[in-house]
Amino acid sequence: AWELTILHTNDVHSRLEQTSEDSSKCVNASRCMGGVARLFTKVQQIRRAEPNVLLLDAGDQYQGTIWFTVYKGAEVAHFMNALRYDAMALGNHEFDNGVEGLIEPLLKEAKFPILSANIKAKGPLASQISGLYLPYKVLPVGDEVVGIVGYTSKETPFLSNPGTNLVFEDEITALQPEVDKLKTLNVNKIIALGHSGFEMDKLIAQKVRGVDVVVGGHSNTFLYTGNPPSKEVPAGKYPFIVTSDDGRKVPVVQAYAFGKYLGYLKIEFDERGNVISSHGNPILLNSSIPEDPSIKADINKWRIKLDNYSTQELGKTIVYLDGSSQSCRFRECNMGNLICDAMINNNLRHTDEMFWNHVSMCILNGGGIRSPIDERNNGTITWENLAAVLPFGGTFDLVQLKGSTLKKAFEHSVHRYGQSTGEFLQVGGIHVVYDLSRKPGDRVVKLDVLCTKCRVPSYDPLKMDEVYKVILPNFLANGGDGFQMIKDELLRHDSGDQDINVVSTYISKMKVIYPAVEGRIKFSTGSH
């Protein structure tokens, strides 16, 4: 028998520095977690102790903090090289700055193979990107070789900016021939490493003949065997065992997100490459693990540029940006409109001639808007200003919801109106009218939504049975502020870009902004 240790990360999302327990900015260092310096300590400890070790990343290193905003992926290549990753799969967020924003900072600089079998380049891009990412890689480990096949969510064109010269194929269809090639090369230990979410990971384990292990990402799935060490609730045991269609037991793993855990899986193979046993658990990277001093010093060196960036002007406002709780928790506020407009603008994807865009709606809990921005400071808006408005380090995500769920959400928005509670929704691409004289749960009297399958966007009444795409904060997608109906009834959820980054990019693009209060949210006569 031959034993392999797979160390894995996924959805690190720019958390190069240690973070608080909830993966936001580290405040009390003695209770902080993760970060590349701490990760390196643990990886090196395992490499020294065990003979056959692979360090793999399942995508979405890009996007999530000011590190990515400033360094645009150069930080990912630099620190992943320093940690000596063995391979990485492309995630959807790796395309957030377009193909060039992937090629130059990461693909050309990474000293490890970057993989995806279901992304096919065409046109002029094909020769430019040739060899910079691969469908699979055979890695030598000890006296054996291990095949790694990559995959990426086929939804990427709707979630990011891969352009028109990359085709995202069905994962299973694309993976099978690559696995077959590996078998033809007499490679009999094969890991599928990719970024399509836990449900697809399980399908790959079930359907792709020859895959021995699946290491996934995208859904931020936390798996654990035994008592979990922090706040995350396990979605299943680690590893999660799937019985393949040809009767094999295939371990599937993921390691939550944000570099909080290091996935640790030990696999035993027989001489024919069959998995005999698999066991392990994610390792919580808490403060009991010291940060590696040399990596930490490097982090501190790179940090300097971030501090300078946060005070630079992004753009100007010529109006007061009202982000006060007195406004945003009670009525339409122009800060809410600005943020929602930025959220929609960040998700413009012309992927189908029938649709002007794939999504037109935004909802945003008023309680998530934490500060106004005064225009009387020469109109200057900085990252620092935006960090005061959006201090939680969240993301603006894409969900699919039925009209009926949206209706419930808007009822919840005003179910206890008047108490300055955070669930009052700011909107974009939606016209809502409330009648507060009616009883809670029956206060939405009009709900019109902007069409997407149209050449001239207009507002149509919400249809209860129709499925709509909506951009919203991850906080709401996870049921925050009492929006349990969104969490329970959402049909799809893809995590998006860092909230501040979305707004800062929009302001930089617009240069001068002047959001108005324009009647997106109304109260029917006599009730307000």
Epitope: D86, F112, P113, G131, L134, V141, V145, T184, N186
Partner: antibody, heavy 118, light 107 residues
């Protein structure tokens, strides 16, 4: 473009050692295997072994174990092969080559002629 | 070790002819066969891998085929620049092994 530049010809005495270099450019050195191949005058090709610079893994053809030692220097993107206890049987042209994605030899150095003679 | 046998040390052909060079593996190597061309004083040059996948820049007159353990490189219309030494290689398992070579010459 991908290039592998080998060191010049060597004339060495029996029993001595020789170190051949293979300097690469035009690609990320750590991401591809470097293979070494022997070709005796008027004869076929023999695979000596590989080094994978990414993790410095080395695999030898059993026939060349003890004869060749493969190393790599990531900082200069250069692979090396040392041949020891040389005999006339080791007189040959030695090639370094790079894979496309494992196991076939897509790009070759120009070859280094080693002549073992007293 | 897998032995790759190229039974023809020399093959004579004329410009414009179709010619096939064969190579027999001592055991099943599936489609994991590559072909190389070597001219005097030069390094070998990869033509084909995976039995029939042409390497970048290789003219489409070069094709490969497999039938059981018999592997074939075919040149559909021989050009003057094709006169060279051809090696097969199995990339199925280590140690990777080559055939002894077939020299293509003018009749």
């Amino acid at each position: 473009q991908v290039q592998l530049q080998q060191s010049g010809p060597e004339l060495v005495k029996p029993g001595a050692s020789v170190r051949i270099s293979c300097k690469t450019s035009g690609y990320t050195f750590t991401n591809y295997y470097i293979y070494w191949v022997k070709q005796r005058p008027g004869q076929g090709l023999e695979w000596i072994g590989w080094i994978y610079p990414g993790n410095l893994n080395i695999k030898y053809n059993e026939k060349f174990k003890g004869k060749s030692t493969l190393t790599a220097d990531k900082s200069s993107s250069t692979a090396f092969m040392q041949l020891s206890s040389l005999t006339s049987e080791d007189s040959a042209v030695y090639f370094c080559a790079r894979d496309d994605n494992y196991a076939w030899f897509a790009y070759w150095g120009q070859g280094t002629l080693v002549t073992v003679s007293s | 070790d897998i032995v790759m046998t190229q039974s023809h040390k020399f093959m004579s052909t004329s410009i414009g002819d179709r010619v096939s060079i064969t190579c027999k593996a001592s055991q099943d190597v599936s489609t994991a066969v590559a072909w190389y061309q070597q001219k005097p004083g030069q390094s070998p040059k990869l033509l084909i891998y995976w039995t029939n996948t042409r390497h970048t820049g290789v003219p489409d007159r070069f094709t490969g085929n497999t039938s059981g353990t018999e592997h074939t490189l075919t040149i559909s219309s021989v050009q003057a620049e094709d006169l060279a030494l051809y090696y097969c290689q199995q990339h199925y398992s280590t140690p990777f092994t080559f055939g002894s070579g077939t020299t293509l010459e003018i009749k």
